[in-house]
């Protein structure tokens, strides 16, 4: 029978008695930075090349007894999860191991840096196909480790790391907090976040997705035919490294941004019980469990988008929070969220030649988040059109006036602290979907993009009575690019995209009277690319 | 994920450009920063990654490392260069006393210095 974890990541059409997906990552090389490994284990023999790289600290304790099987246990198991003959994800992938963790599973930031540098030099000396680097380790936040990961990622290497086993915010750990790295949390057979002793998987906005990470059967270093169950975010990261190897083997030209978007797109959505996470982290933590794509080709026609949350701004009056997209992604919309509801909106602005999403805290607010909608849109030309606060009572409006540009997102930002407290809602005039509207005291920002075959439409869902949450989703074949609340509702905490659904959150209904003030409208902008669809059909 | 001004401890030590009469004094107004792990038990004081500015060449990294050793020796401190980085980040790994941090932060080309720390299998 198929181990539960392999069944979980396999789309139904691949499920047979044997887990044998096509082309098991044979064009890809996976580097493993971990403990030493037992390379003659039946599961990985001939698949893993042990490099001569070793940089580990001394083991702690005077009585520590180096037992080979214990020294090799973590690395051997992970190599088996990635590419093992019986229990591996990418059975065709070849691996190279670097020893950066000692027999107690302990290493140093400096040793890891030197290991990453070794990989970069190897890549320059002997360029091969796509490279995946698996970092099944974590330490405290490290600027230098994150910087090294960023450089390696920009050299075209896909880095996958463990979120950490500390039942804590992954942003406090490295390399988990590096934006360029694919950070993986762990779930179990019941799709619950993994508990490990008194702790468990890390969570939060620095996690990209989750993957099976509890009771994972893999190669045991106890003997060359032994298997063992291990658990942790390392095991989860190994699954994603295997999936990445499969995807890259099928489409070797995929960029890191494209790979990350596909991993997110093909994940199982909304299956994790979020109650396990601290309340303030639930909205920030992606409810995604990794899976292989249903087919190796044909995903190219879709418009892929993901949601990126900023760090919390902090509570000071003028505090701001910034969310950024990856270098190859386009910022198609920007929204903001505050648990207290006290915010001064958000705006898209240029920073270092790229658009970023900046959210503004308000006086008395506990802080804000900026939420960027980051999309893959080849040959896109996007710009922001801003309308300053209007004098007229009809409110502020802005639209995309350039020929061929379509509206992908709306943002609004205001200077006054109590915007809209006693103001009636401003309604968008019918038949004018290609414009953003807002309060007359607010400046309105429209994200306008031109890309071959790009078309967008606005979808609204309004609820007259107060509700804590109003949602509107894009239909099949369309991708959510923009998410905002129709202005006029002072109790709106903010808006953000979850997968293909726009969520507008309001204050607790018990504190809000059911006046017209209580009406909430969620506005989604849904886009698709006919050009990508045609290009995909031509390829096939 | 995390911005570079993230949740970690940062100690900023101001530069005194007249110190040691450096031939290649850093540009006016730039401040090299010192970082260390916020989780105390994971800190490894005595080993430091000195990260140099982005376009620094290997030869300049080696020269900066030698300069640190020479200046430390003049003060009676032993230092050991454990590794010179190039290919990913310019810089070097040095074993030295924490007393020398202020001196190291004033070296030319230095962007920031990070104290080494532990990482763990997950």
């Amino acid at each position: 029978s198929i181990p539960w974890n392999l069944e979980r990541i396999t789309p139904p059409r691949y499920r047979a008695d044997e887990y044998q997906p096509p082309d098991g990552g044979s064009l890809v090389e996976v580097y493993l930075l971990d403990t030493s490994i037992q390379s003659d284990h039946r599961e990985i023999e001939g698949r893993v090349m042990v490099t001569d790289f070793e940089n580990v600290p001394e083991e702690d304790g005077t009585r520590f007894h180096r037992q080979a099987s214990k020294c090799d246990s973590h690395g051997t198991h992970l190599a088996g999860v990635v590419s093992g003959r019986d229990a591996g994800v990418a059975k065709g992938a070849s691996m190279r191991s670097l020893r950066v963790l000692n027999c107690q599973g302990k290493g140093t930031v400096s040793g890891t840096l030197i290991g990453l540098e070794f990989i970069r030099k190897s890549q320059l000396v002997q360029p091969v196909g796509p490279l995946v680097v698996l970092l099944p380790l974590a330490g405290g936040y490290s600027r230098v480790l994150n910087a090294a990961c960023q450089r390696l990622a920009r050299a075209g290497v896909v880095l996958v790391t463990a979120a950490g086993n500390f039942r804590d915010d992954a942003c406090l750990y490295s390399p988990a907090s590096a934006p360029e790295v694919i950070t993986v949390g762990a779930t179990n057979a019941q799709d619950q976040p993994v508990t490990l002793g008194t702790l468990g998987t890390n969570f939060g906005r620095c996690v990209d997705l989750f993957a099976p990470g509890e009771d994972i059967i893999g190669a045991s270093s106890d003997c060359s035919t032994c298997f063992v169950s291990q658990s942790g975010t390392s095991q989860a990261a190994a699954h994603v490294a295997g999936i990445a190897a499969m995807m890259l083997s099928a489409e070797p030209e995929l960029t890191l941004a494209e790979l990350r978007q596909r991993l997110i797109h093909f994940s199982a959505k909304d299956v994790i019980n979020e109650a396990w996470f601290p309340e303030d982290q639930r909205v920030l933590t992606p409810n995604l469990v990794a899976a292989l794509p249903p087919s190796t080709h044909g995903a190219g026609w879709q418009l892929f988008c993901r949601t990126v949350w900023s760090a919390h701004s902090g509570p000071t009056r003028m505090a701001t929070a910034v969310a950024r997209c990856a270098p190859d992604e386009e910022l198609l919309s920007c929204s903001s969220f505050s648990r207290s509801g006290k915010r001064r909106g958000e705006r898209m602005e240029a920073q270092g030649g790229k658009l970023v999403c900046r959210a503004h805290n308000a006086f008395g607010g506990e802080g804000v988040y900026a939420i960027a909608r980051c999309c893959l849109l080849p040959q896109a030309n996007c710009s922001v059109h801003t309308a300053p606060p209007a004098e007229a009572s009809m409110g502020t409006r802005v639209h995309c006036h350039q020929q061929g540009h379509v509206l992908t997102g709306c943002s609004s930002h205001w200077e006054v602290e109590d915007l809209g407290t006693h103001k009636p809602p401003v309604l968008r005039p019918r038949g004018q979907p290609n414009q953003c509207v807002g309060h007359r005291e607010a400046s309105i920002h429209a994200s306008c993009c031109h890309a071959p075959g790009l078309e967008c439409k606005v979808k609204e869902h309004g609820i007259p009575a107060p509700q804590e949450q109003v949602t509107v989703a894009c239909e099949e074949g369309w991708t959510l690019t923009g998410c905002s609340a129709l202005p006029g509702t002072s109790h709106v905490l903010g808006a953000y995209a979850v997968d293909n659904t726009c969520v507008v959150r309001s204050r607790d209904v018990s504190t809000t009277g059911s006046t017209s003030e209580g009406a909430v409208t969620a506005v989604a902008i849904c886009c698709r690319s006919r050009h990508l669809a045609q290009a995909s059909q031509e390829l096939q | 994920q995390e911005d570079e001004d993230g949740d970690y401890e940062e100690l900023v030590l101001a530069l005194r450009s007249e110190e040691d009469g450096l031939a290649e004094a850093p540009e006016h107004g730039t401040t090299a920063t010192f970082h260390r792990c916020a989780k105390d038990p994971w800190r490894l004081p005595g080993t430091y990654v000195v990260v140099l500015k982005e376009e620094t060449h290997l030869s300049q990294s080696e020269r900066t490392a030698r300069r640190l050793q020479a200046q430390a020796a003049r003060r009676g401190y032993l230092t050991k260069i454990l590794h010179v980085f190039h290919g990913l980040l310019p810089g070097f790994l040095v074993k030295m006393s924490g007393d020398l941090l202020e001196l190291a932060l004033k070296l030319p080309h230095v962007d920031y210095i990070e104290e080494d720390s532990s990482v763990f299998a997950q």
Epitope: S73, G105, L196, E214, I217, S220, D222, Q230 | -
Partner: antibody, heavy 130, light 107 residues
């Protein structure tokens, strides 16, 4: 679906020997500790012995130490209990069970997390009587 | 060796009742305790592990609590299928011990 099937039980005289076998299916057999548990007629459950994945560690209840030996054959996916110097009080239904547990790392220590005996055989009866 | 004592030895209850079975360890076992259900002529079935974690496929009416030396198994609303014998098991070390069992019968 993992299945465990015991065999080898029967009637034996006091002082005699018997070898119980437990056949398992799938690679998951070799991935976990395994236990033997017995239940005397009309009585409760009593844990007898367990063995690590590779057979390198074994533990026994005091009452069987020196008389019973637990072993496993990974190639044959089988677990065994060699019972010598049998006594009347060893009369029971003997179950083999999988000890589901997992290893994990946390801040430099290698830990074991045990879930319990999640898969059981149907049992084999051992009667020790003259 | 660690001794496990269950109480009561026998418990009579009706369908729909909320029932609680207690297990006491002779020394602290942290949360390393499991609960099993056994029906006549059948092998035991794992219900709860690590004192309070529900095994996959077990109905949510079963719950466990406690740590150290005092543990309880609760069935929130008894169903006809729940009449059986229940055992606790400690696994603080690699040597395990079971409680003597609690027989849950129809009133």
């Amino acid at each position: 679906e993992v299945q465990l099937v015991e065999s080898g039980g029967g009637l034996v005289q006091p002082g005699g020997s018997l070898r119980l076998s437990c056949a398992a299916s799938g690679i998951t057999f070799s991935s976990y500790w395994m236990s033997w548990v017995r239940q005397a007629p009309g009585k409760g459950l009593e844990w007898v012995a367990n063995i690590k994945q590779d057979g390198s560690e074994k533990y026994y209840v005091d009452s069987v130490k020196g008389r019973f030996t637990i072993s496993r054959d990974i190639a044959k996916n089988s677990l065994y209990l060699q019972m010598n110097s049998l006594r009347a009080e060893d009369t029971a239904v003997y179950y083999c069970a999988r000890d589901r547990g997992t290893y994990y790392f946390q801040s430099g220590s290698y830990n074991y997390y045990y879930y319990g005996m999640d898969v059981w055989g149907q049992g084999t009866t051992v009667t020790v009587s003259s | 060796d660690i001794q496990m004592t269950q109480s009561p030895s026998t418990l009579s209850a009706s369908v729909g009742d909320r029932v609680t079975i207690t297990c006491r360890a002779s020394q602290s076992i942290s949360s390393w305790l499991a609960w099993y259900q056994q029906k006549p002529g059948k092998a035991p079935k794992l219900l709860i592990y690590k004192a309070s974690s529900l095994e996959s496929g077990v109905p949510s009416r079963f719950s466990g609590s406690g740590s150290g030396t005092e543990f309880t198994l609760t069935i929130s609303s008894l169903q006809p299928d729940d009449f059986a014998t229940y055992y606790c098991q400690q696994y603080n070390s690699y040597s395990y011990t079971f409680g003597q069992g609690t027989k849950l019968e129809i009133k």
